[in-house]
């Protein structure tokens, strides 16, 4: 039976157009960049700029470019054989845990800690217990145990399917 | 656990449209296609046409272009197939069927609908 | 279109017993990437049809291993080892090496 392919990897189907470059597959594989046509028979280039496929495959269509978010960057456009990379903006991080949204970082460190780590885009500011050196939990302290200001309300989800 | 469960029995008059309804649950519905077979009585099954969830994008068997119109509404993860000009030889039970998006593993349907009787008379 | 031809169209069998249902195809099922794109299904009375073998010889999964398929080029075969009251049912060879995909007549198998 076929992997499934996850709302994440997947991306629309361009009909292909007559001034579309065809090729024949290669032992019923088609290139990064193009995909399988509906009879097997000719590889269809993807669409620069709206789709893409990163490896060798026999999917029936190209996988959707993905459309940075508002609060996001963009640090490399699609091409046809590899998606848009797209990062949150200054001041903003994307968990591990939660890679659909970017939430503001931390502007300071609870009482009794210190901060060692700036705010990333991958990872919040790092604070760390005065004496003792042991890391913060990450947890998000309440507003009066807060040095400064409490985080912001996170940004809205970064649409990772376009 | 996979399913696919679709509409009721529907009689129409020539003339008419139906449309039969492909709830499926069990899956990342737009992780697949959606195709159509029709069933006429006592006779074999004809493939009409497949819906890619993802993309909105239709593949039809060319017998039922202008017959057969394939949507879907993702946020239910429900699929159509609106039959129009109804003719008694559109008399059939109509099921879906899932296929996935490889072309090597595509053209095979692992699992079905239980099937919609579609009965066109006067 | 590709014509798909099964035999017998009825098959009456004991149970225990071997059964065998042919499939014939109009042209070759041998696709331009050397695959063969010939599935069986089972039909059982009152149900959908469900998936048995696909790609000639693979059984999908749950299938039991009582079911088997071979073949090549226009030319295939479902055999079932030893048949059980449960495999009755309409039996469908198709094929997706051509669009359109194609199914069979089907064939009837029943207890004798």
């Known amino acids: 039976e076929s992997a499934l392919i996850t709302q994440q990897d997947l991306a629309p189907q361009q009909r292909a157009a007559p001034q579309q470059k065809r090729s024949s597959p290669s032992e019923g594989l088609c290139p990064p960049g193009h995909h399988i046509s509906e009879d097997g028979r000719d590889c269809i280039s993807c669409k620069y700029g709206q789709d893409y496929s990163t490896h060798w495959n026999d999917l029936l269509f190209c996988l959707r470019c993905t459309r940075c978010d508002s609060g996001e960057v963009e640090l490399s456009p699609c091409t046809t054989t590899r998606n848009t990379v797209c990062q949150c903006e200054e001041g903003t991080f994307r968990e591990e845990d939660s890679p659909e949204m970017c939430r503001k970082c931390r502007t300071g460190c609870p009482r009794g800690m210190v901060k060692v780590g700036d705010c990333t885009p991958w990872s919040d500011i790092e604070c760390v217990h005065k004496e003792s050196g042991t890391k913060h939990s990450g947890e998000v302290p309440a507003v009066e145990e807060t040095v400064t200001s409490s985080p912001g309300t996170p940004a809205s989800p970064c649409s990772l399917s376009g | 656990e996979v399913q696919l469960v679709q509409s009721g029995a529907e009689v129409k008059k020539p003339g008419a449209s139906v449309k039969v309804s492909c709830k499926a649950s069990?899956?990342?519905?737009?992780?697949?296609?959606m195709n159509w077979m029709k069933q006429s009585p006592g006779m074999s099954l004809e493939w009409i046409g497949r819906?890619?969830?993802?993309?909105?994008?239709?593949f039809y068997n060319q017998k039922f272009k202008g017959k057969a119109t394939l949507t879907v509404d993702k946020s239910t993860s429900t699929a159509y197939m609106e039959l129009s000009s109804l003719r008694s030889e559109d008399t059939a039970v109509y099921f879906c069927?899932?296929?996935?998006?490889?072309?090597?593993?595509?053209?095979?349907?692992?699992?079905w609908g239980q099937g919609t009787l579609v009965t066109v008379s006067s | 279109d590709i014509v798909m031809t099964q035999s017998p169209l009825s098959l009456p069998v004991t149970p225990g017993e071997p059964a065998s249902i042919s499939c014939r195809s109009s042209?070759?099922?041998?696709?331009?990437?050397?695959?063969?794109?010939l599935h069986w299904y089972l039909q059982k009375p009152g149900q959908s049809p469900q998936l048995l073998i696909y790609?000639?010889?693979n059984r999908f999964s749950g299938v039991p291993d009582r079911f088997s398929g071979s073949g090549s080029g226009t030319d295939f075969t479902l055999k079932i080892s030893r048949v059980e009251a449960e495999d009755v049912g309409v039996y469908y060879c198709?094929?997706?090496?051509?669009?359109?995909?194609?199914f069979g007549p089907g064939t009837k198998v029943e207890i004798k």
């Open positions: 069927a899932r296929s996935a998006y490889y072309f090597d593993s595509g053209g095979y349907f692992d699992y």
């Open positions: 069990g899956y990342s519905f737009i992780g697949y296609f």
């Open positions: 819906f890619n969830p993802y993309n909105e994008d239709t």
């Open positions: 042209q070759s099922l041998v696709h331009s990437n050397f695959n063969t794109y």
């Open positions: 790609k000639v010889s």
């Open positions: 198709s094929q997706s090496t051509h669009v359109p995909w194609t």
